[in-house]
């Protein structure tokens, strides 16, 4: 299994580019055989993404040999019965790695589509698909999850109750000798080998069988393309190898034999001898999410998708999570508005990135000599005497709170307030009693003019918590 350049195509570019190492991922998509292979149609049968992929470090200029693929299987669960005929879509995606990757992180390198016929429980089928300059070698098979068995996974088996025999009316469940068939829900008599049912009391036939109970092999005339009837259990057989064996037509092309050679009828969007060349043009609308397609007026010229803000990838198929860089500070919510990112700030914060704390003292002046004090997640102004309010803009009567103790008289003053103390008391607020023995007595100041030291007072006020 490998993914790399096709033969005779010169030295193609590596899947990685100059921006450093990359990884390849594979997306497998299963669609009903009758569905259109349009990119937009649903993977109605199932889809899955590869895991555990190796890192490639090739750089431009190096020869891009075929890249070994991981051994890990890509398992695509499917619902209901296995249809037998289906469309297999395999997309090869590149993920750019490294902190200096820049630009689109994901790109769709190749996409191959092919209609296939496969019975469940059979061996691995090998295939080679080419698209553009790339070639993908892979194998695939369909298998039933127990208890389902059969070519359509429509029959149910269950473990035997006894080691050697099944219960009344039940038969050994081929190809599992240790299991028995579950009670039939199909039409009674429906062939367990060649018939199956999705609804009770019906009997649908696998290819090559017909009749109400799928017990009649199809007639010789229904073997197509020079195939001949085989034994009753095998339906139609090929007489020998033919030029269309293995379907040399890539990307869902259908093969027809022409005088010993073959001819591919290519689906829309592909051309070339084997439908190996992608011919997608802007007319096919390859750009998603409002991307603008330029170039690609004809199948021989490449198209380029110019993606709108918020999308990237060669087809604008991937949304860029521009908020993942967490540009908003202080718990702000990042909003990707398409044309720009915006931060919606929590209460108390502002600025393009919510970087300004409205509740801190930065850039917030308190008027009239007030001082900004932070604490408890908020800010307030500690106002100078004579002023109040949120920003110290309101005049206040400094004597309103009766600040002078022990009967001292309060006088408003340009620097704040002055306490004239009653006899026997002293201090800025008359808070100290003079000792009776007079040992610490201070010469009395002229009446009413004892004034607090402004510096001492302001210092005290700054550290006073209300």
């Amino acid at each position: 299994h490998s993914f790399g350049p096709g033969p005779g195509l010169g030295t193609p570019r590596s899947p990685c580019n100059a921006r450093g190492p990359c990884r390849l991922f594979f997306r497998v998509c299963l669609k009903p055989g009758v569905s259109q292979e349009a990119t937009e149609s649903l993977c109605a049968l199932g889809a899955a993404l590869s895991t555990s992929v190796p890192v490639y470090t090739e750089h431009p200029g190096e020869s891009a040999a075929a890249l070994p693929l991981p051994d890990g299987l890509v398992r695509v669960p499917f619902r209901d019965a296995w249809p037998g005929t289906f469309s297999l879509v395999i997309e090869t995606w590149r993920e750019q790695l490294g902190e200096h990757a820049g630009g689109p992180a994901w790109n769709l390198l190749a996409r191959v589509v092919g209609r296939r016929r496969l019975a469940a429980g059979g061996p691995w089928a090998r295939d080679v698909q080419r698209t553009g300059t790339w070639e993908l070698h892979f194998s695939y098979r369909a298998r039933c999850e127990p208890p389902a068995v059969g070519a359509a996974c429509a029959r149910l088996c269950r473990s035997r109750s006894a080691p050697s025999r099944c219960g009344p009316g039940l038969r050994p469940c081929t190809p599992f000798p240790d299991e028995c068939e579950a009670p039939s829900v199909c039409r009674p008599g429906c062939s367990p080998e060649h018939g199956y049912c999705e609804e009770p009391d019906e009997c649908r036939c696998l290819e090559g069988w017909t009749g109400p109970l799928c017990t009649v092999p199809v007639s010789t005339s229904s073997c197509l393309n020079s195939r001949v009837p085989g034994p009753a259990s095998t339906g139609c057989l090929l007489p020998g190898p033919g030029p269309c064996d293995g379907n040399p037509c890539a990307n869902g092309g259908s093969c027809s034999e022409t005088s010993g050679s073959f001819e591919c009828a290519c689906p829309r969007g592909f051309y070339g001898l084997r439908c190996e060349v992608s011919g997608v043009t802007c007319a096919d609308g390859p750009c998603f999410n409002g991307g603008l397609c330029v170039g690609g007026e004809d199948p021989d010229s490449a198209y380029v998708c110019h993606c709108p803000p918020g999308f990237q990838g060669s087809n604008c198929e991937k949304r860029v999570d521009r908020c993942s860089l967490q540009p908003c500070q202080n718990g702000g919510l990042c909003l990707d508005l398409g044309h720009a990112l915006r931060c919606r700030c929590r209460a108390g914060f502002a600025g393009p990135r919510c970087e300004h704390d409205l509740d801190d003292c930065a850039g917030r002046a308190c008027a009239n000599g007030g001082t900004c004090v932070e604490g408890g997640g908020s800010r307030r102004c500690s106002c100078a005497l004579g002023f109040g309010g949120r920003d110290c803009r309101e005049r206040a009567d400094p004597c309103a709170s009766r600040p002078c103790a022990h009967g001292g008289r309060c006088y408003a003053h340009f620097s704040g307030l002055v306490c004239a103390c009653a006899p026997g008391y002293m201090g800025v607020r008359c808070e100290f009693a003079v000792r009776p023995d007079g040992a610490d007595a201070v010469p009395a100041a002229p009446r009413g003019l004892r004034q607090a030291d402004p510096q001492r007072f302001l210092h005290h006020h700054h550290h006073h918590h209300h």
Epitope: L333, G338, R344
Partner: antibody
Framework: QLQLQESGPGLVKPSETLSLTCTVS??????????WGWIRQPPGKGLEWIGS???????YHNPSLKSRVSISVDTSKNQFSLRLSSVTAADTAVYYC?????????????WGQGTLVTVSS | AIQMTQSPSSLSASVGDRVTITCRAS??????LGWYQQKPGKAPELLIY???SLQSGVPSRFSGSGSGTDFTLTISSLQPEDFATYYC?????????FGPGTKVDIK
């Protein structure tokens, strides 16, 4: 079509906890393009945003309701819930859940029909 | 928190009238404003987002304009089903805040 449906008791006693759940149908609550919000409207009055939550659990709420609000999300059930503790008669209102688009442009584009919660003993 | 005011608080108008409702934010909110219509007993419905973008399915007689602090909702020709209460919502910063509403009734 996306639908939101509020559910919870219509009568809560004062000082108890109001609990409401919003069930989202017709869309996934785990989309990266949306926040899921609660808005209330007291009888005869205007609308008040309570808070919003992201599917990953990131929450924003109205500081006016202080620490009484708790919002949670259960992606497995496609639901998000509101709890408002220590309720009083002032919390009597019609409570709406709504989806807020946060990509491209911001707005509440889908609303539940609302459920009236009365706080009374 | 950003305060939103609406004027008028109520108005009476006739079918066919041109009606204008204004919404003012206490600080600049760019164009992060929506208009919602609410009918009695019903949930609000989005009319306009991003100040001037018409929500899908809303009749084109509704239009919005404004940026910064002053915004306007205009109903070019009032229809019977337009009699309702209209709210503006700023979604510029948390907490998200609604205007007090404008009631439009029949003259």
């Amino acid at each position: 079509q996306l639908q939101l449906q509020e559910s919870g008791p219509g009568l809560v006693k004062p000082s108890e906890t109001l609990s409401l759940t919003c069930t989202v149908s017709g869309g996934s609550i785990s989309s990266s393009s949306y926040y899921w919000g609660w808005i209330r409207q007291p009888p005869g009055k205007g609308l008040e945003w309570i808070g919003s939550i992201y599917y990953s659990g990131n929450i924003y709420h109205n500081p006016s309701l202080k620490s009484r609000v708790s919002i949670s999300v259960d992606t497995s059930k496609n639901q998000f819930s509101l709890r408002l503790s220590s309720v009083t008669a002032a919390d009597t209102a019609v409570y709406y859940c709504a989806r807020e688009i946060i990509v491209g442009a911001t707005h509440f584009d889908y609303w539940g029909q609302g459920t009236l919660v009365t706080v009374s003993s | 928190a950003i305060q939103m005011t609406q004027s008028p608080s109520s108005l009476s108008a006739s079918v066919g009238d041109r009606v204008t409702i204004t919404c003012r934010a206490s600080q600049g909110i760019r164009n992060d404003l929506g208009w919602y219509q609410q009918k009695p007993g019903k949930a609000p419905e989005l009319l306009i987002y991003a100040a001037s973008s018409l929500q899908s399915g809303v009749p084109s007689r509704f239009s919005g304009s404004g940026s910064g602090t002053d915004f306007t909702l205009t109903i070019s020709s009032l229809q019977p089903e337009d009699f309702a209460t209209y709210y503006c919502l700023q979604d510029y910063n948390y907490p998200l805040t609604f205007g007090p509403g404008t009631k439009v009734d029949i003259k």
